[in-house]
Interface confidence: low
């Protein structure tokens, strides 16, 4: 056993190079100095070690750095990153965006693994907020990243970072997440003129309140049906037929195809039928003419 773990004569590694791929696992363990490995980590990625050999190299680094790897090593882990467990990664202190990019590159083209999720969590917590550069990087690798965060986590996104968000980054966000992001977007884009503002804010409108939708209806924005269908039902219900007509512009005709789906269905149920008839779309289900409409929410507030 003692002989097996001793490095055979002439096999001591002087540098990390291709010759090591011919070493058996026990030879790698015995003949590669962990400190040498740490200083030459940048060479490992371009040498196609087998997975078993990578296990040995990881073990050597774990022994050298039981409290967690230094960033100088982490940045050059390359494929070895895929061997790390979330528990390993929780020991790291990653502060450089370059290090984050290098490790995300290894996982590029794949869904977010538990390792990557832990790495990002460590990185963002270390920075204290999701700054624009970090968000830029993360959404470039994972377009759905933003929507994977809880509303609480999203609250740490500064409004300035919203400039890094692309429409596709919000595709899988639910209303609770958009509720948090919308006010930040409104703040971020507040100095833009009407049409430019609408282009930027459009993807976030799933979090917009009624008063903001009313304001938009006065600006000839021509909202498309896809955006309208993502609006909060409670924000759409109070809009008048005239306001919806102005909000949608030429797209108003699309309401007919969506009349059985939320929020259109619920909105129709709240409108007078004769108001709906003015659209000329054949929308049915409004409040019949002659009925008295009571605003129960107002009544409850008064009592």
């Amino acid at each position: 056993e003692v002989e097996k773990t001793a490095c055979p004569s002439g096999k001591k590694a002087r540098e990390i190079d291709e010759s090591l791929i011919f070493y058996k696992k026990w030879e790698l363990e015995a003949c590669v100095d962990a400190a040498l490995l740490a200083t030459q980590m940048d060479r490992v990625n371009a040498i196609p070690f087998t997975y078993e050999q990578l296990d040995v190299l990881k073990h050597k680094l774990d022994e050298l750095y039981p409290q967690g790897y230094p960033e100088s090593v982490i940045q050059h882990l390359g494929y070895l990153f895929l061997k790390m467990s979330p528990e390993d990664i929780r020991k790291w202190n990653v502060t450089s965006l370059e290090t984050l990019k290098a490790l995300l590159e290894v996982n590029k083209g794949h869904e977010m693994s538990p390792q990557v999720a832990t790495l990002i969590d460590r990185f963002v917590k270390g920075r204290g907020q999701l700054d624009k550069d970090t968000l830029d990087t993360l959404t470039a690798f994972y377009p759905g990243y933003l929507c994977s965060l809880s509303p609480e986590e999203l609250s740490s996104v500064p409004p300035s970072s919203i400039w890094a968000v692309r429409p596709q980054d919000l595709d899988t966000c639910d209303p609770r997440q958009l509720d948090v992001l919308y006010p930040k977007a409104r703040l971020a884009f507040q100095n833009m003129n009407g049409s430019e503002y609408f282009v930027k804010i459009q993807s976030f409108l799933g979090g917009a309140p009624t008063e903001d939708l009313k304001a938009l209806s006065q600006q000839n924005v021509s909202m498309d049906l896809a955006t309208f269908m993502k609006l909060r039902t409670d924000a759409v219900l109070p809009l008048t037929v005239a306001e919806v007509q102005k909000l949608l512009g030429p797209h108003v005709e699309g309401l007919k195809a969506e009349e059985r789906h939320r929020p259109v269905r619920d909105w129709i149920l709240r409108q007078r039928q004769d108001d709906l008839d003015t659209l000329g779309l054949g929308l049915q289900g409004g409040i019949p003419n002659g009925y008295l409409v009571l605003d129960l929410s107002m009544q409850e507030a008064l009592s």
Epitope: E18, I47, Y79, L82, G109
Partner: antibody, heavy 119, light 107 residues
């Protein structure tokens, strides 16, 4: 995106040599090893070896030792595979390929270069 | 060298069928096995690595499993576009080796 662009088809006489190029783009060339795989007409895939573009180090399959030379030019992000003393059974499509996830499963492939050896 | 033996060498099945291809390794190769799909005149396309991990973008009707030195690629609900030759490849040790291939034809 990652691309591997190979040189065009070659016709060679028995005993001659052929040199196939593989120009890469869309990733750091020196960061990943490049493999060469060949496929004779109607046959399966055969691994020939790899080159580490970072150092120029190589690892050839035993079958091709002494006949194959893999080199690279980092200034133009291009790898080369030269096969000498060609025989008719070297007629094949030659592919360069890059792994994508460590451990040598090959994800990114060139379009292939047909080398025909005929007298 | 690790030899990989694929069976069957060819198979003909109808759209909607389930097809299984087996790859036997001559010695232990862990789970370090990949599956490729190759269509005529094209380079191979990675379907699966680590025996059972589906490559992104590959339909979920493809699945892989491992039992000792025997690996299986299964294609559920066969589609016309699945007509191709399938290869296994081990990357446990050098030299890297491929199976002989299985040609799948749609009836």
């Amino acid at each position: 995106q990652v691309q591997l662009q190979q040189s065009g088809a070659e016709v060679k006489k028995p005993g001659a040599s052929v040199k196939v190029s593989c120009k890469t783009s869309g990733y750091p060339f020196t960061g990943y090893s490049l493999h060469w795989v060949r496929q004779a007409p109607g046959q399966g895939l055969e691994w020939m070896g790899w080159i580490n573009p970072n150092s120029g180090g190589t690892n050839y399959a035993q079958k091709f030792q002494g006949r194959v030379t893999m080199t690279r030019d980092t200034s133009i992000s291009t790898a080369y595979m030269e096969l000498s003393r060609l025989r008719s059974d070297d007629t094949a499509v030659y592919y360069c390929a890059r792994d994508h996830y460590g451990g040598n499963s090959l994800f990114y492939w060139g379009q292939g270069t047909l080398v025909t050896v005929s007298s | 060298d690790i030899q990989l033996t694929q069976s069957p060498s060819s198979i003909s099945a109808s759209v909607g069928d389930t097809v299984s291809i087996t790859c036997r390794a001559s010695q232990d190769s862990g789970t370090w096995l990949a599956w490729y799909q190759q269509k005529p005149g094209k380079a191979p396309n990675l379907l699966m690595y680590d025996a059972s991990t589906l490559e992104d973008g590959v339909p979920s009707r493809f699945s892989g499993s491992a039992s000792g030195t025997e690996f299986t690629l299964t294609v559920n609900r066969l589609q016309p576009e699945d007509s191709a030759t399938y290869y296994c490849q081990q990357y446990n040790s050098y030299p890297l080796t491929f199976g002989g291939g299985t040609k799948v034809d749609i009836k």
